[in-house]
């Protein structure tokens, strides 16, 4: 079953290569277990950035080596991606699945264009 997912159109990463955005889903029911996946689309290539599952009201659990962190509040997921560089600029798509209880719902956002600008190196001071 389909579900609506909303996310901001554009986000600018900080000078330290950190970008945050909210992924909001219109839950048709009372989901207790949710899976969130962030995918990056660039040059028609789609790659998985990170994925997490969480029980409603709890922290998101990403893999240990994940570049993502996040928190949840109701039907909103606050996602933070770190370690970004200019080459990582692209469309970051939020995918939400309501895993339990049945029925299973799937929603895919339109994507957040994240712009990353590498900071200029500091000039050497004599």
């Amino acid at each position: 079953k389909a579900m609506h997912v909303a996310q901001p159109a554009v986000v600018l990463a900080s000078s330290r290569g950190i970008a945050s955005f909210v992924c909001e889903y219109a839950s048709p029911g009372k989901a207790t277990e949710v899976r969130v996946t962030v995918l990056r689309q660039a040059d028609s290539q789609v790659t998985e950035v990170c994925a997490a599952t969480y029980m409603m009201g709890n922290e998101l659990t990403f893999l240990d080596d994940s570049i993502c962190t996040g928190t949840s509040s109701g039907n909103q997921v606050n996602l933070t991606i770190q370690g970004l560089r200019a080459m990582d600029t692209g469309l970051y798509i939020c995918k939400v699945e309501l895993m339990y209880p049945p029925p299973y719902y799937l929603g895919i956002g339109n994507g957040t264009q994240i712009y990353v600008i590498d900071p200029e190196p500091c000039p050497d001071s004599d």
Epitope: L39, T47, E48, I93, K95, I108
Partner: nanobody, 119 residues
Amino acid sequence: EVQLVESGGGVVQAGGSLRLSCAASGGTFSFYGMGWFRQAPGKEQEFVADIRTSAGRTYYADSVKGRFTISRDNAKNTVYLQMNSLKPEDTALYYCAAEMSGISGWDYWGQGTQVTVSS
């Protein structure tokens, strides 16, 4: 056109095992993910398990965790569901599904294979 064909269903006693297979045909492709869903008569569709190609990462519904194992053979474009310690409540029509990219949703579905667990 991609086709998914399930097999391996049947009738089994509670506590028994079955291995479902889902073969994809119709071209050369690399799926982002493949999974299994089930639907019992008069009940909603339920997610069972899936596996993502990128890291071979698997995910299971709590109701089957520790009893079911999903695996895939990329060379054969086939995904398997090994079901052990079956319970009467596992009785359902089991569907295989595949998604071409992570942002396409479940693009392809099989016709399903019936699993009946008798007590």
